[in-house]
Structures are given as structure tokens and as C-alpha cells.
């Protein structure tokens, strides 16, 4: 008899896009409409929740912009929280200082991406220093991962 | 009898590098010489053509530089075109404004990378706002993808 | 009789983080403590040594910062060395010029990431132009790869 058909495992992947009703940290994300992907990973209150231990490539881009530059320090972090650990672990971070001409309209992006060994129940979040300076267009600000 | 040898499927992957004879949008790319990769994906008139539906990590870097900074707004987009849809879809985008000191020699890169669900016959392209300010060195300006 | 259990091949992956005792080029990396990964790839004197030919996604981020901006040109390169070839091959590179306001405290990151066809015994390194301006926090400066 022929062997049973191979069960193709669903790829664990997420691509979430900017959501302009973020009011506080961590950033919240669009998980339903547009060019969003969410498969084999859960989204909960701004976080991507890992449900299978393994290696993941995690990435995020944030688009900062303002009408009148005053060079406020900008930071963009991807961090991990797990109930087993008391403290957040910053996985990747980008900082910018002195990046535009005082008084001018300005725009700048921060991109982060790397491989991590994640454990089931890890929660991943994105934090920025100046929420009011983030533009949430889906092509400009996003957060994602995939299991290798 | 032993089973037939497993047919190893070719990985769908592309890494194209800057081509300085780009005269208009979308950018054109070197698809033959140097550190170029093109396997299981076609290159046509600036675009990467998908021939198998699935999840892809898509990335691009563009290196902008100039001799006398005027702070013209810079944009770098990866977009998708498919004959089924009337309009281009901007998948990822980076913008820069007020990024250098007036009159000075300057240089800056924009990097984009994320996961998308692409469909057979999708065409992916890269667009920039100021073609004359792009440097096309193969290590500096590139466009690629791979199927997860 | 049931077939022998499938031997799950170890994923070839690395994620190395900044090491502040780097004194010269290429940069040296933390390969043991913290959020480091090293599996199926060797680390030797600043380099990641490939031991299996194939397609790899290679990435690096470097965080530059200083107390008083004088706009020294910054460069960040990922390059490859192989005993078969006389010269280093620059795979990816980022350059920055005129990126901050003279005299001010400043901070900026460079991110690189792309797919390459690597050969067994290739050594991959990271080079920067201004070592004294690099901050080596593990979340800010890193170097990694994984086999597709």
C-alpha cells in the first residue's frame, strides 16, 4: 500500500504592520488587514507569542518623521518577555541622535533583523522612544518573524 | 528495492546587484556577473518574476550619495505588480528627509527586508526618488529574495 | 520493520554579538555568552568559517556613536576571504558621510543583510572604518548568518 500523504507543516511566520492607534508601549500592530501574515504564531496585545521552540529570524522597521527637527533621541527595540524571567531581554536595538537639521521637516527609518533561539511562550514586542514621531504606514513600519 | 533517490528541489533565490545604466524607474539590476544569484526566479526588465506561490523573504539596499548636500527627499520602495490588479502594491518603503549638512559630501543607505506571501506571476521591482544620487556598486545597492 | 528514525540535521546558524576588546580589524565577536548562537559554523579570530557549501543569509548591524560629531566617514563591510583567492571579496557595505551636526553627541546604525552562495572554507568578517566610534552592546552590534 502507498504511504499516507505527507502532512505539510504550516510555516510559522508573521508580518504585522503599523497601527496608528498605538497609545503606549509596546507598539500595537495590525494583524488582520492588508499585507499582514500570521501563521503558527499568535498575536496578543502588541506581542508575537511563540508556540514552538526553535530558531527564528526576527525583524522590524520603524519610520520616524517630524515637522520641525529638534533631534530628540530616537530608539527602536525588539525585546522578549517570558513569565520565567523577571526582566525583559532586549534582543535588538537601534538608536539615533543628531540626525537632522534643527527646525526642518525630517524623516528617518530604523531597521533591525537577526536570528534568535526562541522558546515556546516567549512574547516578542517592539518599543520606541518617541511614539508621536512614528508613522504607521503599512509599508514603512512593520514587525515580523519566521521559523527557520 | 531501495526507494528512488530524493529529487532535491532547487532553492528559489535571487540576489541582484546595482546596474549603473539604469536610466528610469524601476531600477535595473545586474543579473549575470559578480556576486549575483538567480535560481527558480526570473529577471525581466528590472523585475523579479515569481513562478511559485509561497512565502518569500524580500530585501533591498540602496546606497545614496552626493557631493553638495541639498537634502532632496529620498525614497526607496519595493513594490509588486500583477496583471490581475490595476495598481502597484508598495510592500516596503524607506524615506529620508533632512539627512545631511547643506553643501557637504554625504552618503547614506536605506535597507528594507520582510516576509510576504507572493503569488505566481507577481513582478517585484525597486523604485527610488532620485536616480542620480544612487551609487550602483555591487556591495552597496542590491535586491534579493528567497523562498522560505 | 519500521524505518530508522530520521536524523534531524542541525541547522547551520550563527549570531555573534559585539565584543568591546576588539583592537583592530576585522572586528572580534562574542561567541559564548548572552544571546549568542553558533551551530554548524565555526568562529575563528573574528571570522565565521563555513563548513558546508550552500546558500546563506548573512547579516550584520553596527552601532556607531560619539560625544562630539566631526563627521568622520564611517564604513561597515562584510567581506569574505578564502585561501583560493588572493583578495578579499566585499559582499555588502554601508557608508555614511555628513550624518550629524558638528560638535553634538550623535548615534547611528548601519544594517546589512543579503543572500550569498558560500563555499566550504570561506571565512566571513566584518570591518569598520572607525573602531573607536563603535559601541559593542549585544543588542546593537552583531553579526550572523543561517543556511537556507
Amino acid at each position: 500500500p502507498s504511504p499516507p500523504p505527507e502532512k505539510k507543516e504550516l510555516r510559522k511566520v508573521a508580518h504585522l504592520t503599523g497601527k496608528s492607534n498605538s497609545r503606549s508601549m509596546p507598539l500595537e500592530w495590525e494583524d488582520t488587514y492588508g499585507i499582514v501574515l500570521l501563521s503558527g504564531v499568535k498575536y496578543k496585545k502588541g506581542g508575537l507569542v511563540i508556540n514552538e521552540t526553535g530558531l527564528y529570524f526576527v525583524y522590524s522597521k520603524v519610520y520616524f518623521r517630524g515637522q520641525s527637527c529638534n533631534n530628540l533621541p530616537l530608539s527602536h527595540k525588539v525585546y522578549m518577555r517570558n513569565s520565567k524571567y523577571p526582566q525583559d531581554l532586549v534582543m535588538m536595538e537601534g538608536k539615533m541622535m543628531s540626525y537632522c537639521t534643527t527646525g526642518q521637516m525630517w524623516a528617518r527609518s530604523s531597521y533591525l533583523g537577526a536570528v534568535f533561539n526562541l522558546t515556546s511562550a516567549d512574547h516578542l514586542y517592539v518599543n520606541v522612544s518617541e511614539l508621536s514621531l512614528v508613522n504607521f504606514e503599512e509599508s514603512q513600519t512593520f514587525f515580523g518573524l519566521y521559523k527557520l | 528495492p531501495s526507494p528512488p533517490p530524493e529529487k532535491k528541489e532547487l532553492r528559489k533565490v535571487a540576489h541582484l546587484t546595482g546596474k549603473s545604466n539604469s536610466r528610469s524607474m524601476p531600477l535595473e539590476w545586474e543579473d549575470t556577473y559578480g556576486i549575483v544569484l538567480l535560481s527558480g526566479v526570473k529577471y525581466k526588465k528590472g523585475g523579479l518574476v515569481i513562478n511559485e506561490t509561497g512565502l518569500y523573504f524580500v530585501y533591498s539596499k540602496v546606497y545614496f550619495r552626493g557631493q553638495s548636500c541639498n537634502n532632496l527627499p529620498l525614497s526607496h520602495k519595493v513594490y509588486m505588480r500583477n496583471s490581475k490588479y490595476p495598481q502597484d502594491l508598495v510592500m516596503m518603503e524607506g524615506k529620508m528627509m533632512s539627512y545631511c549638512t547643506t553643501g557637504q559630501m554625504w552618503a547614506r543607505s536605506s535597507y528594507l527586508g520582510a516576509v510576504f506571501n507572493l503569488t505566481s506571476a507577481d513582478h517585484l521591482y525597486v523604485n527610488v526618488s532620485e536616480l542620480s544620487l544612487v551609487n550602483f556598486e555591487e556591495s552597496q545597492t542590491f535586491f534579493g529574495l528567497y523562498k522560505l | 520493520p519500521s524505518p530508522p528514525p530520521e536524523k534531524k540535521e542541525l541547522r547551520k546558524v550563527a549570531h555573534l554579538t559585539g565584543k568591546s576588546n576588539s583592537r583592530s580589524m576585522p572586528l572580534e565577536w562574542e561567541d559564548t555568552y548572552g544571546i549568542v548562537l553558533l551551530s554548524g559554523v565555526k568562529y575563528k579570530k573574528g571570522g565565521l568559517v563555513i563548513n558546508e557549501t550552500g546558500l546563506y543569509f548573512v547579516y550584520s548591524k553596527v552601532y556607531f556613536r560619539g560625544q562630539s560629531c566631526n563627521n568622520l566617514p564611517l564604513s561597515h563591510k562584510v567581506y569574505m576571504r578564502n585561501s583560493k583567492y588572493p583578495q578579499d571579496l566585499v559582499m555588502m557595505e554601508g557608508k555614511m558621510m555628513s550624518y550629524c551636526t558638528t560638535g553634538q553627541m550623535w548615534a547611528r546604525s548601519s544594517y546589512l543583510g543579503a543572500v550569498f552562495n558560500l563555499t566550504s572554507a570561506d571565512h566571513l568578517y566584518v570591518n569598520v572604518s572607525e573602531l573607536s566610534l563603535v559601541n559593542f552592546e549585544e543588542s546593537q552590534t552583531f553579526f550572523g548568518l543561517y543556511k537556507l
Epitope: 537639521t101 | 537634502n71 532632496l72 | -
Partner: antibody
Framework: EVQLQQSGAELVRPGVSVKISCKGS????????MHWVKQSHAKSLEWIGV????????RYNQKFKGKATMTVDKSSSTAYMELARLTSEDSAIYYC????????????WGQGTSVTVSS | DIVLTQSPASLAVSLGQRATISCKAS??????????MNWYQQKPGQPPKLLIY???NLESGIPARFSGSGSGTDFTLNIHPVEEEDAATYYC?????????FGGGTKLEIK
């Protein structure tokens, strides 16, 4: 045809100010920075400064800080330079010159504006 | 600031011969494989006109008898064969960093 048309010659008394103009035509004005250069018998050619025609931000040669003020009016594709508290040392021909950001040099120059300071 | 020293201050060359003008910079004007040195020609009552950019590149519309060479701190403008209309003052100028500076000029006379 690319042209940088400068305002006419000025004869002014010491201590006053003068504002000279440079109107660009035949190209996209905001794509090029505008530089100003002084030419006097004593000092040959001296770079005064540069202004971003796109965002209006200017950079000056230390020597001309407080002396020269550069501005732009994008709507009329015109760059201006005001020279303050004029002395006989400021008597010279002043040129505007555009600089393509993607190139290496000032490729087109205005015809020059002669400023003579005399009591 | 980078100081540019031109020599000679003036020279007279016979029609059809070679004119050579030197420009020395107080520090290198090279960066990343390029030399940021330019040459201009100025005739009386006219603005400077760009001849050579990035040390050796001929500006569009400039006759091929003009050529530039050099790197680092030492640069040369050559005109060969010299023609009547080449009588003018020639200036070198760097664009490596702000402030840009010019050489003192070389006045070319045709004999």
C-alpha cells in the same frame, strides 16, 4: 538653456547693506545647491557659502559669517545674498553658481554682480 | 582649510605648444578613489567656466586639448596644442570639504 541671471551692479556707501539676487532658469531650481563666490583683485576667488535651494538651510565660510546672509525663494527660483555693514574691503564681483549634488563641481555660474563701496 | 598653491602665477606659451599649470594642496583632496579637484577658465569680464572636474574628467563641450591629471596633493592642467582663444586666467578649486578654496590663479598669455 540653463541660466543664472544676477541683479545689476551696485554702488553703495560704507555701513549700509546690499542684497543681490540670482534667478535660475532652464532647470529644476530646487535640485541644485547654490554657492556664492567673491572675486576681488586682492584675494582672487573666495568661497562665501552654500544654501540648500530645497530646504533653505545655509552654510558659511567662517570668514563671511556675520557679513553674508543667504536666502532662497523657491516660488521664484531665486537665491539671494545680503551683505551687511559694507566697507571698501567688500568691493568685489559676487558670483552665484549652482552645484549638482551628483557631480563634482559648480557647473554653471551667474554673470556676476559688481558691488562698489565708496563714500 | 585646505590651501591651494598654483604655479606659475603667469606664463606665456607659443601657439601650438603645451601649457602646463600646477596646483598643490596643503592636504590630500582624495576620498574613496576620487580626487576632488576642479579646474576653471576665466576670461576678462566673464564668470569662471568649468573645464575639468574630479582631477581628470573633461566637462561637456570643452575641447579635448584640455586635460587634467594628478591625485592626493599634486595636480596638473595641460593645454596642448594651445590656441589663441585659450588666453585666460586658470584656477584650481577643491570640493573635498567645506570651505571650498581656490588657487591664486595662473594667467596664460599666447605668444
Amino acid at each position: 538653456e540653463v541660466q543664472l541671471q544676477q541683479s545689476g551692479a551696485e554702488l553703495v556707501r560704507p555701513g549700509v547693506s546690499v542684497k543681490i539676487s540670482c534667478k535660475g532658469s532652464g532647470y529644476t531650481f530646487t535640485d541644485y545647491t547654490m554657492h556664492w563666490v567673491k572675486q576681488s583683485h586682492a584675494k582672487s576667488l573666495e568661497w562665501i557659502g552654500v544654501i540648500s535651494t530645497y530646504q533653505g538651510d545655509a552654510r558659511y565660510n567662517q570668514k563671511f559669517k556675520g557679513k553674508a546672509t543667504m536666502t532662497v525663494d523657491k516660488s521664484s527660483s531665486t537665491a539671494y545674498m545680503e551683505l551687511a555693514r559694507l566697507t571698501s574691503e567688500d568691493s568685489a564681483i559676487y558670483y552665484c553658481a549652482r552645484f549638482p549634488d551628483w557631480d563634482y563641481a559648480m557647473d554653471y555660474w551667474g554673470q556676476g554682480t559688481s558691488v562698489t563701496v565708496s563714500s | 582649510d585646505i590651501v591651494l598653491t598654483q604655479s606659475p602665477a603667469s606664463l606665456a606659451v607659443s601657439l601650438g605648444q603645451r601649457a602646463t599649470i600646477s596646483c598643490k594642496a596643503s592636504q590630500s583632496v582624495d576620498y574613496d578613489g576620487d580626487s576632488y579637484m576642479n579646474w576653471y577658465q576665466q576670461k576678462p569680464g566673464q564668470p569662471p567656466k568649468l573645464l575639468i572636474y574630479a582631477a581628470s574628467n573633461l566637462e561637456s563641450g570643452i575641447p579635448a586639448r584640455f586635460s587634467g591629471s594628478g591625485s592626493g596633493t599634486d595636480f596638473t592642467l595641460n593645454i596642448h596644442p594651445v590656441e589663441e582663444e585659450d588666453a585666460a586666467t586658470y584656477y584650481c578649486q577643491h570640493s573635498r570639504e567645506l570651505p571650498y578654496t581656490f588657487g591664486g590663479g595662473t594667467k596664460l598669455e599666447i605668444k
